[in-house]
């Protein structure tokens, strides 16, 4: 004969465990039903009655099958340097990630504890490695024949336009200026951008920074100490 299916609550056989989505209640000494995600145990089981579950209240959640007496509180609202990438529901906690232009310098189990603004590359320098969710921007000097005239965390060095006749030669922070005759090859207008970190790319993107009005001779200055390598701000 096939074994009978026991309905909760039931006393487990000695040495056996309760089935999936059940738990052993020490007080009742019975296998009882767990509550589904989005619910919690309102009344624990007894020898004769199963667990009574109830829905989580607003701003609380349970993500797993459980028998907790109270749902967990969702995390606080996302801060001004973050965007909400997962809303607080009865079944999941809110997740905040750093907004565009920022990276997570200190992670927590889900989301980010502390966001920091990405470094920017000054005129004469372009982005060598873009910022990611968890790493800062790395800049590099623009090589001969390329330039960047912006202070930006996304702009890379781009080629000088090639002129028939050069009026002003380009340098690391300025494009070449051609005489009134049109250049033989002109780059597409506007700066070349690197994408923002994937998780926030579609969220609240900010306008492209305008070119800095600072003098564009910074690349001529003697180089100071090397900037920290990517990731060196982490512990």
């Amino acid at each position: 004969l096939p074994a009978q299916v026991a309905f909760t609550p039931y006393a487990p056989e000695p040495g056996s465990t309760c089935r999936l989505r059940e738990y052993y209640d020490q007080t009742a000494q019975m296998c009882c039903s767990k509550c589904s995600p989005g619910q919690h145990a309102k009344v624990f089981c007894t020898k004769t009655s199963d667990t009574v579950c109830d829905s989580c209240e607003d701003s609380t959640y349970t993500q797993l099958w459980n028998w907790v007496p109270e749902c967990l509180s969702c995390g606080s609202r996302c801060s001004s340097d973050q965007v909400e990438t997962q809303a607080c529901t009865r079944e999941q906690n809110r997740i905040c990630t750093c907004r565009p232009g920022w990276y997570c310098a200190l992670s927590k189990q889900e989301g980010c504890r502390l966001c920091a603004p990405l470094r920017k590359c000054r005129p004469g320098f372009g982005v060598a490695r873009p910022g990611t969710e968890t790493s800062d921007v790395v800049c590099k000097p623009c090589a001969p024949g390329t330039f960047s005239n912006t202070t930006s965390s996304t702009d890379i060095c781009r080629p000088h336009q090639i002129c028939n006749v050069v009026a002003i030669p380009g340098n690391a922070s300025m494009d070449a200026v051609c005489t009134s005759t049109s250049p033989t090859r002109s780059m597409a207008p506007g700066a070349v951008h690197l994408p923002q970190p994937v998780s926030t790319r579609s969220q609240h993107t900010q306008p492209t920074p305008e070119p800095s009005t600072a003098p564009s001779t910074s690349f001529l200055l003697p180089m100071g100490p090397s900037p920290p390598a990517e990731g060196s701000t982490g512990d």
């Epitope: 920091a116 590359c121 000054r122 900010q206 009005t213």
Partner: antibody, heavy 121, light 110 residues
């Protein structure tokens, strides 16, 4: 590249006051601006920041007491209802130190000379 | 709230001596820490950023170190011109910040 505060004066408690930070040599669409104050004989106290995109954030104690706004070349700090405890020198400071091809937005440089606000009845 | 605790509040040093100022964050700040010098009646001056990088024009007698929650400013070969108040500052201006600055340390040179 410089910043300079103005608008500091003697006011009576409860009289709204607006301080202005005027920037030159750089763009407010590239750099954040912080407001910091220093009561006589006391330490530096961060009030808040306006980011390049116009978003503002404030120290816990300053929320609701101050607002920050900006134009293309100025940043205003409004003290909604000053009390005698708001007597201090108010500084604006750019969020962003330029070095080695980088702008480090977490360091404050340059600073303005400060403007003195005295709140007294 | 993220809080910076700076010690000592005041320190005396002999010319040529060494001064050590400590700054403790209530949680890790991942090296996003700066040090400032302020003399009476003047604006603060940035000395060190990212915990250990000296700004241009600042004497190599100043040294920043530390990581995680513990940071230190060391002034070697103290000179009379070093008499000032020094402040640490963390680089987070997001939510739940009480003050980005430590309480300050007054350095008195004898």
């Amino acid at each position: 590249q410089s910043v300079e505060e103005s608008g500091g004066r003697l006011v009576t408690p409860g009289t709204p006051l607006t301080l202005t930070c005027t920037v030159s040599g750089f763009s407010l669409s590239t750099y954040d601006i912080n407001w910091v104050r220093q009561a006589p004989g006391k330490g530096l106290e961060w009030i808040g920041i306006i980011y390049t995109g116009g978003i503002t954030n404030f120290a816990n104690w300053a929320k609701g007491r101050f607002t920050i706004s900006k134009t293309s070349t100025t940043v205003d700090l409004k003290i909604a209802s000053p009390t005698t405890e708001d007597t201090a020198t108010y500084f604006c400071a750019r969020g962003g130190y330029d070095s080695d091809g980088y702008v480090y937005p977490d360091a404050f440089d340059p600073w303005g000379p400060g403007t003195l606000v005295t709140v007294s009845s | 709230a993220l809080v910076m605790t700076q010690t000592p509040a005041s320190v005396e040093a002999d010319v040529g001596g060494t001064v050590t100022i400590n700054c403790q964050a209530s949680e890790s700040i991942s090296n996003l820490l700066a040090w400032y010098q302020q003399k009476p009646g003047q604006r603060p001056k940035l000395l060190i950023y990212r915990a250990s990088i000296l700004t241009s024009g600042v004497s190599s007698r100043f040294k920043g170190s530390g990581s995680g929650t513990e940071y230190t400013l060391t002034i070697n070969g103290v000179q009379c011109a070093d008499a000032a108040t020094y402040y640490c500052q963390h680089g987070y201006t997001g939510t739940n910040v009480q003050n980005v600055f430590g309480g300050g340390t007054e350095v008195v040179v004898k």
